[in-house]
Amino acid sequence: ALDAAYCFRNVQDNCCLRPLYIDFKRDLGWKWIHEPKGYNANFCAGACPYLWSSDTQHSRVLSLYNTINPEASASPCCVSQDLEPLTILYYIGKTPKIEQLSNMIVKSCKCS
Amino acid sequence: ALDAAYCFRNVQDNCCLRPLYIDFKRDLGWKWIHEPKGYNANFCAGACPYLWSSDTQHSRVLSLYNTINPEASASPCCVSQDLEPLTILYYIGKTPKIEQLSNMIVKSCKCS
């Protein structure tokens, strides 16, 4: 799996999970989230050559097409596979609210 | 939806469905498929700016992050959303076989 266990310990040009810490205020301009101040969002990036973690039959066909026709502009892309929620604390007036924001943290990647 | 109805009639730099015909023999080097000789595989490509068809909360956050931090290398990617199968005819020896290859045709795209 193209997850932290694999990607964070290997130097990897190909599609892999990359670390990304997002500070809500600094990076997104959000002041409405009280806690946490930021979180490890991570992201997916890297090349998708033939045989590298293809998601579907189409993405594998596309990577083969791209290998045989390197001048082609059609190629698969490295995107998130497994995501996890993030629990946040915010306020409506003076009332604290705890909310779970779905699909906020990328845990693994794929070529799609 | 970022499908043929929308994308093929609009000139679109942003994430959209793009036409791609794949000739099995010429483009993939495949002789094993007897029929069809090729098919409209299509592919997804284009930029994923903020508010453009984000798939998940994470991809929306990432596009906002990328808008506020344009020097960042982290951004969502345009990938397939809906896919359809392709029915093919091939031979095992002299015996004809009809098979449905799943997820071979891209019908729409998303920013993920």
Epitope: L51, S54, Q57, R60, L64, I68 | K25, L28, G29, W30, K31, W32, I88, Y90, I92, K97, E99, L101, S102
Partner: nanobody
Framework: QLQLVESGGGLVQPGGSLRLSCAGS????????MAWSRQAPGKQRELVAL???????AYVDSVKGRFTISRDNTKKTMSLQMNDLKPEDTAVYYC????????????WGQGTQVTVSS
Amino acid sequence: QLQLVESGGGLVQPGGSLRLSCAGSGIAFSRVTMAWSRQAPGKQRELVALITDGNRSAYVDSVKGRFTISRDNTKKTMSLQMNDLKPEDTAVYYCVATDWVPTRRDYWGQGTQVTVSS
């Protein structure tokens, strides 16, 4: 169930040659896309070369002009002729077959070590 067995690896001096072979059994070999992939210690896995059932081939830039991939469907074999070997070619080389029906599946050999050193 496809079985792949590689042979031909070994120790060779820089500038030397080796020929890797891969024998397949248990599948319609004539329709699969065959490839050689390699992994050096501490480096990412890398596609070296591939060859389709229609004999279309492709190579990673670093081996173009030095390596030649070929296949013989009647004998169910594939080979990789490696000339002008360099120390950076040192890796475990894997034979890979991709069958496309009824669903896509990759079959990997156990690998053969190639060491280029003086």
